[in-house]
């Protein structure tokens, strides 16, 4: 078997064996090495010398195998746009941002650029749980049977109705999607002014 060519090597068909780690240099019609993530081209290749790479300076990065002569500048997560940092910028990776708690991504261009406050879910509903936090606005769904939620909130969850018998009490008024069960002492009638409250 023939030995594998090592960059730089001639290429007549303008393609290189390893598309990820090599690139075609048209001036000399050769295949040269790309620079690995975290580095950039400090000296271009020639027919007798392969690409020379150097590490990106602090606060700059290149994410992929490349033949760039500069590194990209790290950008902070913009709190004015509702973003917060989850992972720092390194020579190999841009700063990783996400929406701040209670916000969702309202504008997406390859990555999130702008977050907005999540909508409130009205009493009797809760926000449908999403696979990824911050991906979309709340979709409010009704509380399932036997549960209630009594506030307007972006994050409140439906809670199970109180079971009066577990507390040695009896039910005075059944729970609804928006209110808990009202319990009373089995020996007392419920006074009119106390309706809608729980008596212990």
């Amino acid at each position: 078997s023939q030995p594998q060519a090592v960059p730089p090597y001639a290429s007549e068909n303008q393609t290189c064996r390893d598309q990820e780690k090599e690139y075609y240099e048209p001036q000399h019609r050769i295949c040269c090495s790309r620079c690995p993530p975290g580095t950039y081209v400090s000296a271009k290749c020639s027919r007798i010398r392969d690409t020379v790479c150097a590490t990106c300076a602090e606060n700059s990065y290149n994410e992929h195998w490349n033949y760039l002569t500069i590194c990209q500048l790290c950008r902070p997560c913009d709190p004015v746009m509702g973003l917060e940092e989850i992972a720092p910028c390194t020579s190999k990776r841009k700063t990783q941002c996400r929406c701040q708690p209670g916000m969702f991504c309202a504008a997406w261009a390859l990555e999130c650029t702008h977050c907005e406050l999540l909508s409130d879910c009205p009493p009797g509903t809760e926000a449908e749980l999403k696979d990824e936090v911050g991906k979309g606005n709340n979709h409010c769904v009704p509380c399932k049977a036997g549960h209630f939620q009594n506030t307007s909130s972006p994050s409140a969850r439906c809670q199970p109705h109180t079971r009066c018998e577990n507390q040695g009490l009896v039910e005075a008024a059944p729970g609804t999607a928006q209110s808990d069960t009202t319990c009373k002492n089995p020996l007392e009638p419920l006074p009119p002014e106390m309706s809608g409250t729980m008596l212990m």
Epitope: P37, G38, T55, C56, A57, E58, N59, S60, E63, H64, W65, I86, A87, P88, C89, T90, S91, K92, R93, Q96
Partner: antibody, heavy 121, light 112 residues
Framework: EVQLLESGGGLVQPGGSLRLSCAAS????????MSWVRQAPGKGLEWVST????????YYADSVKGRFTISRDNSKNTLNLQMNSLRAEDTAVYYC??????????????WGQGTTVTVSS | DIVMTQSPLSLPVTLGESASISCRCS???????????LDWYLQKPGQSPQLLIY???NRASGVPDRFSGSGSGTDFTLKISRVEAEDVGVYYC?????????FGGGTKVEIK
């Protein structure tokens, strides 16, 4: 030879302060991020803080945020950890470590011998 | 925070045999440009930790080739192909994809 040597550990009362230092030699100190990692008695490793080569970026574990401050003096090849409002749970051996690659956080390839911090009344 | 779960907790091995340690992460450590933000460390008894593997599968300088790292996404393995007496100690995995950086709980390797 690349070397890291920690100092400044000792016994301190809860609520007290301590300043750890790490003297580096054998490499271009300003070109590398540096970290502090601690190990409580009989327990595993816990990352505490990391600082970039220039000192412009700092990162902290939630358990020490607001109490500990990492800093560096590149002219003296020294890494520091100022520890305030110390708690019993901060008791540990504190290691300083050099990050393998310039401007990265993967691979702490050189570690000091550690300095012991005991927080007790 | 990313949770790193190592298994087993303790691993008795026979000299010359192979050994594998597992590290499972609560979210993927595979970054978009294809590298994996996972390191492996060994802490020998009475010593400071030492770096074995960085970026998932790259051996650190001076580390014997009997150590190898593999895996993708959330499941990773450190393999010691022929265990030697000097390999005893506690092995830790660590993620560096996001702060706070987090370690696994450790796996103690001892000779049977």
């Amino acid at each position: 030879e690349v070397q890291l040597l920690e100092s400044g550990g000792g016994l301190v009362q809860p609520g007290g302060s301590l300043r750890l230092s790490c003297a580096a030699s054998g490499f271009t100190f300003s070109s590398y991020a540096m970290s502090w990692v601690r190990q409580a008695p009989g327990k595993g490793l816990e990352w505490v803080s990391t600082i970039s080569g220039s000192g412009g970026s700092t990162y902290y574990a939630d358990s020490v945020k607001g109490r500990f401050t990492i800093s560096r003096d590149n002219s003296k090849n020294t890494l520091n950890l100022q520890m305030n409002s110390l708690r019993a749970e901060d008791t540990a051996v504190y290691y300083c470590a050099k990050v393998r690659d310039n401007w990265n956080y993967d691979g702490m390839d050189v570690w000091g011998q550690g300095t012991t911090v005991t927080v007790s009344s | 925070d990313i949770v790193m779960t190592q298994s087993p907790l303790s691993l008795p091995v026979t000299l010359g045999e192979s050994a594998s340690i597992s590290c499972r992460c609560s979210q993927s450590l595979l970054y978009s440009s294809g590298y994996i933000d996972l390191d492996w460390y060994l802490q020998k008894p009475g010593q400071s930790p030492q770096l074995l593997i960085y970026l998932g599968s790259n051996r650190a300088s001076g580390v014997p080739d009997r150590f190898s790292g593999s895996g993708s996404g959330t499941d990773f393995t450190l393999k010691i192909s022929r265990v030697e007496a000097e390999d005893v100690g506690v092995y830790y995995c660590m993620q560096t994809i996001q702060t706070p950086l987090t370690f696994g709980g450790g796996t103690k390797v001892e000779i049977k």
